[in-house]
């Protein structure tokens, strides 16, 4: 049998018989261009690919439409991959997402949902998202009906304010809605009554800001 | 839409009581805290009580502690006002208002009813 | 209770000139997020508030531009570039910062 030597994602990579966690190539579906992100082997079976990572507060999240295009950050560290990446991947096969979360008093919780894919640029990056199951709230943290994506020059939220500026980051803001993993980094006992800091309101709140969160995606049938 | 409907006032006796609801529609009421506002004839705006998107956190003015009684029912996206004990000063035009942004975040407030008067003579 | 000061209490503003209205508060606004807790509102003859400006510098969707707010921690102002019939109201600036929430006397604009 051939070896395979471009991967969609790392449930691909984790099935070639590479399992250790790390930074890996991927391929975008139906191209020759090349992306980096982080393999998660560990966590559940492995097999995940990471989207989004926050831990220290080391890389500026206020960025651009085109950045969150596009992906920023390093893979190593806090990063966000990509929302075309990730559009493209997610509306191939289906996903699943898990959320990880953690707070500054030494609690993880997680938010896990069996459906999700993120729409195409011309629709904004709408996010879908079905079946939550997870430690991190009964209520989605995620606004249902998904949101279209906004950062600080595209403002696609439904609120007569401007949520990515006030808020700070690039998310699926509603008005603005009960979660935001890309907000500013608040280190900890600075870390209450921030509503522009890292968010997921069915678990800690409104003004609390989180230490530590993953987004990681996988096939569902993996 | 975001519309917020009032309706309930009149004139009433001193001592008397009265209920003011303001229906709201064209949003998520179950995600939003609200406040009453009153504007007494002439005046400026004085905030009168705030209740969180689940009732479960409740602030009044120190005018109106213990007459008035501020609730919310989000299966019928109704907010309500109970006014006690009312008096001559109580006069004025209540707004009902949402908060500008979601899940209880107190900024500001992004839309107001249409108001609604209540006169306390005798 | 954070007391809020604005000046001028009336403003006679010739139609095409610049209009600009002061709002003092008795205490900081700053809030440890960045954020100044000052909005303004505006009163319409005859109708309910509208928000303006949104803590301290942040126009609300719809506003034309020609109305912007600045300051920070005790001193603010709302500028309107170029004042239109339209905008003859009342002006309000609130704080948001404690509770309760609290207002300014609010300014008279009127057309010359």
């Known amino acids: 049998k051939e070896e395979q030597t471009t991967f969609r994602d790392c449930a691909e990579i984790f099935k070639s018989g590479l399992t250790t966690s790390g930074i890996y190539t991927l391929t975008f579906p139906n191209s020759t261009e090349e992306i980096k992100a982080y393999c998660d082997m560990d966590v559940g079976g492995g097999g995940w690919t990471v989207i989004q990572h926050r831990e220290d507060g080391s890389v500026d999240f206020q960025r651009t439409w085109k950045e969150y295009k596009e992906g920023f950050g390093s893979p190593l560290g806090e990063y966000w991959l990509g929302n075309e990446f990730v559009s493209q991947l997610t509306g191939q096969h289906r996903y699943v997402l898990k959320i990880q979360l953690k707070d500054w008093e030494g609690n993880e919780a997680h938010s896990l949902y069996d459906h999700f894919y993120l729409a195409g640029e011309e629709s904004n990056y709408r996010i879908h998202l079905t079946g939550l199951t997870g430690t991190a709230g009964k209520i989605s943290s995620i606004s249902q009906p998904g949101s279209d994506f906004s950062t600080k020059d595209s403002d696609n939220d439904k609120c007569i304010c401007k949520c990515s500026q006030m808020l700070s980051g690039g998310w699926w803001f509603d008005a603005c809605g009960p979660s935001n993993l890309n907000g500013q980094y608040y280190p900890q006992k600075q870390n209450t009554n921030k509503f522009n800091g890292i968010k997921w309101y069915y678990w800690k709140g409104s003004g609390y800001s989180l230490k530590a969160t993953t987004m990681m995606i996988r096939p569902a049938d993996f | 839409e975001v519309q917020l409907v009032q309706s309930g006032g009149g004139v009433v006796q001193p001592g008397r009581s009265l209920r003011l609801s303001c229906a709201a529609s064209?949003?998520?009421?179950?995600?939003?805290?609200m406040h009453w506002v009153r504007q007494a004839p002439g005046k400026g705006l004085e905030w009168v009580s705030y209740?969180?998107?689940?009732?479960?956190?409740?602030y009044y003015a120190d005018s109106v502690k213990g007459r008035f009684t501020i609730s919310r029912d989000n299966a019928k996206n109704s907010l309500y006002l109970q006014m006690n004990s009312l008096r001559a000063e109580d006069t004025a035009v209540y707004y009902c208002?949402?908060?500008?942004?979601?899940?209880?975040?107190?900024?500001?407030?992004?839309?107001w009813g249409q108001g609604t008067l209540v006169t306390v003579s005798s | 209770d954070i007391v809020m000061t604005q000046s001028p209490l009336s403003l006679p503003v010739t139609p095409g000139e610049p209009a600009s209205i002061s709002c003092r508060s008795s205490?900081?606004?700053?809030?440890?997020?960045?954020?100044?807790?000052l909005n303004w509102y505006l009163q319409k003859p005859g109708q309910s508030p509208q928000i303006l400006i949104y803590?301290?510098?942040n126009r609300a969707s719809g506003v034309p531009d020609r109305f912007s707010g600045s300051g920070s921690g005790t001193d603010f102002t709302l500028k309107i570039s170029r004042v239109e019939a339209e905008d003859v109201g009342v002006y309000y600036c609130?704080?948001?910062?404690?509770?309760?929430?609290?207002f300014g006397q609010g300014t008279k604009l009127e057309i010359k």
């Open positions: 208002a949402r908060d500008l942004l979601d899940y209880d975040i107190l900024t500001g407030y992004g839309y």
């Open positions: 064209g949003f998520t009421f179950s995600s939003y805290g």
């Open positions: 209740i969180s998107s689940s009732g479960s956190t409740i």
């Open positions: 205490q900081s606004l700053l809030h440890s997020n960045g954020y100044n807790y």
């Open positions: 803590l301290g510098s």
């Open positions: 609130m704080q948001g910062l404690q509770t309760p929430p609290t």
